[in-house]
Interface confidence: low
């Protein structure tokens, strides 16, 4: 009943199986991999999306850190454990009983350990820095036009409240989008910045998660904005705990 009624699909998540078996024969959609019912009027959580995507090839990358506590997703894809609300469980383990703690966007924030490893709470990622490099254009984009277009995109496509887009920085050809959302700021029904950032990342790669919508066509005053590379940095409300060996 959360999906488009006529053809029973999930507008916000194509990685679903939908059927008219909800109350009163209404359309109901379940995420691939987990079988969890999803709310098709908003973004699906990153945890459920990663679980659904597990058949995709591994995607590891090494990034430069902008601050000592920033995290990057170097581990690539894994099959996560999600809680009943679709959020990442604080402790993740693989089939060989290697475990680690993750933050609210599913990025590892501790050294890997064994089954005795404790992760007391799911630490919230409250600041995400999306670093983009755009392809050469005739001239630089107008900063205020670029800012307005990116804010519009996050509001209209990803349904993220404008107050959570903290800043858009631009020094040709680098664009930085800062998303900030503290636990205290996030009200019931708010899209999570981690989910919005993940949908944006997939859109930029040409792997849109939306059902039937065309790919992302970003334009600033009619000029196409084509992204060459994307780096995403995650800052947690509590700094990560890695051994000194990893930091050197």
């Amino acid at each position: 009943h959360t999906a488009a009624q006529d053809n029973c699909t999930c507008p916000t998540n194509k990685m679903t199986v939908c059927s008219p078996d909800g109350p009163g024969g209404r359309c109901q959609c379940r995420a691939l991999g987990s079988g969890m019912a999803v709310d098709c009027s908003t973004l699906t959580s990153k945890c459920l999306l990663l679980k659904a995507r597990m058949s995709a090839p591994k995607n590891a990358r090494t990034l430069v850190r902008p601050s000592e506590h920033a995290l990057v997703d170097n581990d690539g894809l894994y099959d996560p454990d999600c809680d009943p609300e679709g959020r990442f469980k604080a402790r993740q383990c693989n089939q060989t009983s290697v475990c680690w703690c993750v933050n609210s966007v599913g990025v590892r924030r501790t050294d890997k350990g064994d089954l005795s490893l404790r992760c007391d709470e799911l630490v919230r990622t409250h600041h995400i820095l999306i670093d983009l490099r755009h392809r050469p254009t005739a001239g630089a984009f107008n900063h205020s036009d670029l800012d307005a277009e990116l804010r519009r995109l996050f509001r209209e496509r990803y349904r993220l409240h404008p107050k959570f887009v903290a800043a858009v920085h631009y020094e040709q050809p680098t664009i930085q989008i800062e998303l900030r959302q503290n636990t205290s700021q996030k009200a019931a029904g708010d899209v999570d910045i981690g989910d919005a950032a993940y949908y944006f990342e997939r859109d930029i790669k040409g792997e849109s998660l939306f059902q039937g919508r065309g790919g992302l066509d970003l334009r600033v005053r009619g000029e196409p904005l084509q992204v060459e590379r994307t780096l995403i940095y995650y800052l947690d409300e509590i700094p990560p705990k890695f051994s000194m060996k990893r930091l050197t």
Partner: antibody, heavy 121, light 107 residues
Framework: QVQLQQPGAELVRPGASVKLSCRAS????????MNWVKQRPEQGLEWIGR????????HYNQKFKDRAILTVDKASNTAYMQLSGLTSEDSAVHYC??????????????WGAGTTVTVSS | DIVMTQSHKFMSTSVGDRVSITCKAS??????VAWYQQKPGQSPKLLIY???YRYTGVPDRFAGSGYGTDFTFTISSVQTEDLTVYHC?????????FGPGTRLELK
């Protein structure tokens, strides 16, 4: 239970201003936008604007931007709308209504009973 | 601004009938449409949000559907107390806008 309380009526002169109040109870005031909606007799509903009680961020319908001022008093969980330069067009029921912060939730799940504003000399 | 159009200002029905009210958005609003019922002298009451979600406590004879620009609100079996005005609203972007309303009356 969740309630938005508004005074029943206000009688004002043309050209004057009026300040309408809306007292929230039964929920966390700062967890929702407070919206104001106008309804003229036998007509549709018109969104005037909204305010975030946390930081008093406001969004206005352009049509009302120059004449409506939205404020909140967090201590008393009360929202206010001041309308200036009143004309007969402002004779209407003015409702306050709450909505969630996420854009998926920009519908109005709780409404006040409305204040009937009558502009007359 | 997104304009919401309800093609019928009045609709005639009988008790026990199935009736559908339509609402059209001037641009794509995804599933961000809500439906309200308003009885004379009362404030509007939320029935449906996000196109097809029934609000808490709303009887299951009320349903909504649609995506993009075309939306439908359906009462599966009209009761006497349902004969009143229904408004649609887009909750996709500001300024938030409403349809002009459709009055359901007895045939």
């Amino acid at each position: 239970q969740v309630q938005l309380q508004q005074p029943g009526a206000e009688l004002v002169r043309p050209g004057a201003s009026v300040k309408l109040s809306c007292r929230a109870s039964g929920y966390t005031f700062t967890n929702y936008w407070m919206n104001w909606v106008k309804q003229r007799p036998e007509q549709g509903l018109e969104w005037i604007g909204r305010i975030d009680p946390n930081d008093s961020e406001t969004h206005y319908n352009q049509k009302f931007k120059d004449r409506a001022i939205l404020t909140v008093d967090k201590a008393s969980n009360t929202a206010y709308m001041q309308l200036s330069g009143l004309t007969s067009e402002d004779s209407a029921v003015h409702y306050c209504a709450r909505s969630g912060f996420g854009s998926t939730y920009w519908f109005f799940d709780v409404w006040g009973a409305g204040t009937t504003v009558t502009v007359s000399s | 601004d997104i304009v919401m159009t309800q093609s019928h200002k009045f609709m005639s029905t009988s008790v026990g009938d199935r009736v559908s009210i339509t609402c059209k958005a001037s641009q794509d609003v995804s599933t961000a449409v809500a439906w309200y019922q308003q009885k004379p002298g009362q404030s509007p009451k939320l029935l449906i949000y996000s196109a097809s979600y029934r609000y808490t406590g709303v009887p299951d004879r009320f349903a909504g559907s649609g995506y993009g620009t075309d939306f439908t609100f359906t009462i599966s079996s009209v009761q006497t107390e349902d004969l009143t005005v229904y408004h649609c609203q887009q909750h996709y972007s500001t300024p938030l806008t409403f349809g002009p309303g459709t009055r359901l009356e007895l045939k």
